[in-house]
């Protein structure tokens, strides 16, 4: 008799834990920026504070009739999904509602900004426990709305936003496109992307993960004990806000970076049929459905990493793409990907005290993506070692020469424009353990880290025959930190990480002219953190 | 996202014919004007004036007041609807789009964004 969405996101072992804490004495507070809500509804009565905040535009149309239950519908349902007594994810969590959407579900960027500022003021006046802000709304890309989210996130507030219901790239909408926000797409009971009329859930690199968002049973503002089903990325975001509230009630000191990494790490992987998304967005969209993670006490000092894609560089000859990790995360490796295969590689550089992953387009290329591998490595000390391109025919070697530093990633950047004259770089674990090896005209960058108990190894997999991609996975207990393609043919599209899988992509035309001796190799650097051990390279 | 995707950024740094005042002429606008790429979602006439990050509280108020004063000289009435202090320095203003060039030349202004709609999802 449990609704499908709760069954999906709350594993069986959590159900009993929840039963032991009926009204939770959690200090977590969720702020909901939405429509007005029906506070007397049994699902939320006693746990919701309806603030006096109200910043909404006038309703359209002269004949618009303001009916309370309709005005409250969206917000009441979401409040119920977050903390409802019977159909809520974080039953008993206290919730504060701010009205930024009118009776037609419309608001403004300025009204939302004033709402976010209201939360910041409340935080300054009366500091409390962890705060979660749910933004079940979307507008066009807004630099200032994203900036406001960034500022609020840096004060320790966790923001969760709807990806948007436009069946479009979430990066074109705000606050979904703000990197500091946890952006949530919607899936149905079959774990497939939600279709809403002719539209549906947004997708792309700005989505962090998906959550149930179709036919979600929740509080209906029609009456104080009524329920109804609603669909959308708002509902999906409300699930994740509820999960985050539960994580924080167990462990109030979890940071945004830790929360995001744990949400990603413990989500259900590879159940979404990616064919629903446009072809160019499939590689950028995470195949992740949220579930409530176990506590850190149960899972120990696991090395957690996520893949962050840059925006597309654009096709100009010198176009670069930049991918950034969150301030708390370590950039352990950088790779690049181009659909045309025309790219001049990737490298790591420091910008404003933060290391970023950069990729460069090549002449005639349609553009590149930079792909950063961002990890949580407690007490890490990481540095980049690079060697300029060697003279023709010579190899370039880079290794981690500092004591107790291990290789977590390699990057290669070619000085030459002409793709035909260069031999691509290589990484060879058997001959040079812990080294990045580049060939003619390649600058080589090694990402080297020292952290208590950090150990790494290279794992390779090569395919000689025709294949569009070569993959290699890190074993259980190991985390993928670096991913490179070691080509046998002249043209590769690049490499990227999907969860713990290193994917090396090969150009279609390269498959046809490949001889059997030229294997394309996917090379993964797999690391693990064993706090008792000292940093080491595993051969 | 770091890059401003499907987003309109317009440079409105052209000197106005009436900008004869020394303090105005001295300041060349480097600020940009931004608005939503979806025309139907735009709210022309309401603008969020975003100031440089390190702008002090008093300077925010002075900038808003300066805009009102200069607009009045040109026969425009503008209304400051809200001043942002806590999340970012800036203010929300209701004014004619004719004044955007003038506003972009104010000291401390980083960019101006036209207000736009957001929707329940």
């Amino acid at each position: 008799s449990i609704p499908w969405n709760l069954e999906r996101i709350i594993p069986a072992w959590h159900q009993t834990e929840e039963d032991r804490s009926p009204d939770g004495s959690s200090q977590v507070e969720v702020y909901l920026l939405d429509t007005s809500i029906q506070g007397a509804h049994r699902e939320i009565e006693g746990r919701v504070t309806i603030t006096d905040f109200n910043s909404v535009p006038e309703e359209d149309g002269t004949r618009f009739h303001r009916q309370a239950s309709k005005c409250d519908s969206h917000g009441t349902h979401l409040a119920g999904v977050v903390s409802g007594r019977d159909a809520g994810v974080a039953k008993g969590t206290s919730l504060h509602s701010l009205r930024v959407l009118n009776c037609q579900g419309k608001g403004t960027v300025s009204g939302t900004l004033i709402g976010l500022e209201f939360i910041r003021k409340s935080q300054l006046i009366q500091p409390s426990g962890p705060l979660v802000v749910l933004l079940p709304l979307a507008g066009g890309y807004s630099r200032i709305l994203n900036a406001a989210c960034r500022h609020l996130a840096r004060t320790g507030v966790v923001l969760v936003a709807a990806a948007g219901n436009f069946r479009d790239d979430a990066c074109l909408y705000s606050p979904a496109s703000a990197p500091e926000v946890i952006t949530v797409g919607a899936t149905n009971a079959q774990d497939q992307p939600v279709t809403l009329g002719t539209l549906g859930t947004n997708f792309g690199r700005c989505v962090d993960l998906f959550a149930p968002g179709k036919d979600i049973i929740g509080a209906s503002s029609d009456c104080s004990t009524c329920f109804m089903s609603q669909s959308g990325t708002s509902q999906a975001a409300a699930h994740v806000a509820g999960i985050v509230a539960r994580m924080l009630s167990r462990e109030p000191t979890l940071t945004l970076a830790e929360l995001r990494q744990r949400l990603i790490h413990f989500s259900t992987k590879d159940v979404i049929n990616m064919a629903w998304f446009p072809e160019d967005q499939q590689v950028l969209t995470p195949n992740l459905v949220a579930t409530l993670p176990p506590s850190t006490h149960e899972t120990g000092g696991q090395l957690l990493c996520r893949t962050v894609w840059s925006a597309h560089s654009g096709p100009t000859r010198t176009a670069t793409a930049t991918a950034r990790c969150a301030p708390e995360e370590e950039l352990l490796s950088c790779s690049s990907f181009s659909r045309s295969g025309r790219r001049r590689g990737d490298w790591i550089e420091a910008i404003g005290g933060q290391q970023v992953c950069k990729a460069l387009n090549a002449f005639g290329g349609e553009g590149v993506y930079a792909v950063a591998r961002c990890c949580l490595v407690p007490r890490a000390n990481c540095s980049i070692h690079n060697t300029p391109a060697a003279r023709a025919g010579l190899e370039t070697h880079v290794h981690c020469h500092q004591k107790d530093h291990v290789l977590t990633g390699c990057s290669f950047h070619w000085e030459v424009e002409d793709l035909s004259v260069r031999r691509q770089p290589a990484l060879r674990s058997r001959r040079q353990p812990g080294q990045c090896v580049g060939h003619q005209a390649a600058s080589v960058y090694a990402s080297c880290c020292h952290a208590p108990g950090l150990e790494c190894k290279i794992k390779e997999h090569g395919i000689s025959g025709p294949s569009e991609q070569v993959t290699v996975a890190c074993e259980a207990g190991w985390t993928l930190t670096g991913c490179n393609v070691l080509p046998g043919a002249s043209l590769t599209l690049g490499a990227y990480s999907v969860d713990n899988l290193c994917v090396a992509r090969v150009h279609d035309t390269a498959r046809a002219d490949r001889t059997s001796g030229e294997a394309t190799v996917a090379a993964a650097i797999c690391c693990r953190s064993r706090p008792s051990a000292k940093a080491s390279w595993v051969q | 996202q770091d890059e401003d995707g499907d987003y309109e950024e317009l440079m409105l740094a052209l000197p106005s014919q009436e900008d004869g005042l020394a303090d105005e002429a001295a300041h060349v606008a480097t600020a940009t004007f931004r608005r939503c790429s979806k025309e139907a979602w735009r709210l022309p006439g309401t603008y969020i004036v975003v100031l440089m990050e390190e702008t002090q509280r008093l300077q925010i108020e002075q900038t808003a007041h300066r805009l009102q004063t200069r607009a009045a000289r040109r026969g425009y009435v503008i209304k400051v609807l809200h001043i942002f202090y806590d999340l970012f320095p800036g203010f929300l203003v209701k004014m004619s789009s004719d004044l955007l060039g003038l506003a972009l030349k104010l000291p401390h202004v980083e960019y101006i964004e036209e207000d736009s709609f957001v929707f329940a999802q």
């Epitope: 008799s1 009204d23 239950s69 019977d86 039953k91 008993g92 009456c223 004990t225 009524c226 | -």
Partner: antibody, heavy 126, light 106 residues
Amino acid sequence: QLQLQESGPGLVKPSETLSLTCTVSGGSIGSSSYYWTWIRQPPGKGLEWIGSINYRGSTYYNPSLKSRVTISVDTSKNQFSLKLSSVTAADTAVYYCARENSGVVPAAGPNWFDPWGQGTLVTVSS
Amino acid sequence: EIVLTQSPATLSLSPGERATLSCRASQSVSSYLAWYQQKPGQAPRLLIYDASNRATGIPARFSGSGSGTDFTLTISSLEPEDFAVYYCQQRRNWFTFGGGTKVEIK
């Protein structure tokens, strides 16, 4: 079929706490589909809802009585209880317990009070 | 709170006659209204829910109608066992009951 039975003292002194228990038979109080409710009826008057509780112990009270009411549940005994503090003569009534569908699972039946216990009269008097 | 006013307070009719009971809400309760029957010394019994749906085991002579603020319970032909007190109840906002209508034998 499901039956509910109220029990507790029939006489309570003013300013003391009224305590009643409702025992559920023919079904489990641990079902997530229902709320368990207390309703009262002063002699010769109408009905007044007091409050409700679900199997997890999550409560929902009449705002006018909230400060004095505590409802609790014991799933192991298949019982739920009412405590009403600082009673006065105005609290003299027949107290009923009843079941109500939570509404989350529509198949569980109408979202109303059905069935009811037969009621127990509690008199507040010194 | 939403106040429900029932009328008449007492309805004196003979068996076989048609009974029409009214319940008026102080504000709209949509269709979130139920009717209960209570016989002396017994607990109330659910007759009609959501304004017009008969509860399980309730004879077809009982019917409910109305929405918003005005509701009616109709007993098409009174049987001897129908003489009792009838209460309406809303769940639009919290739970409140009407004062009751007593249907007595004329």
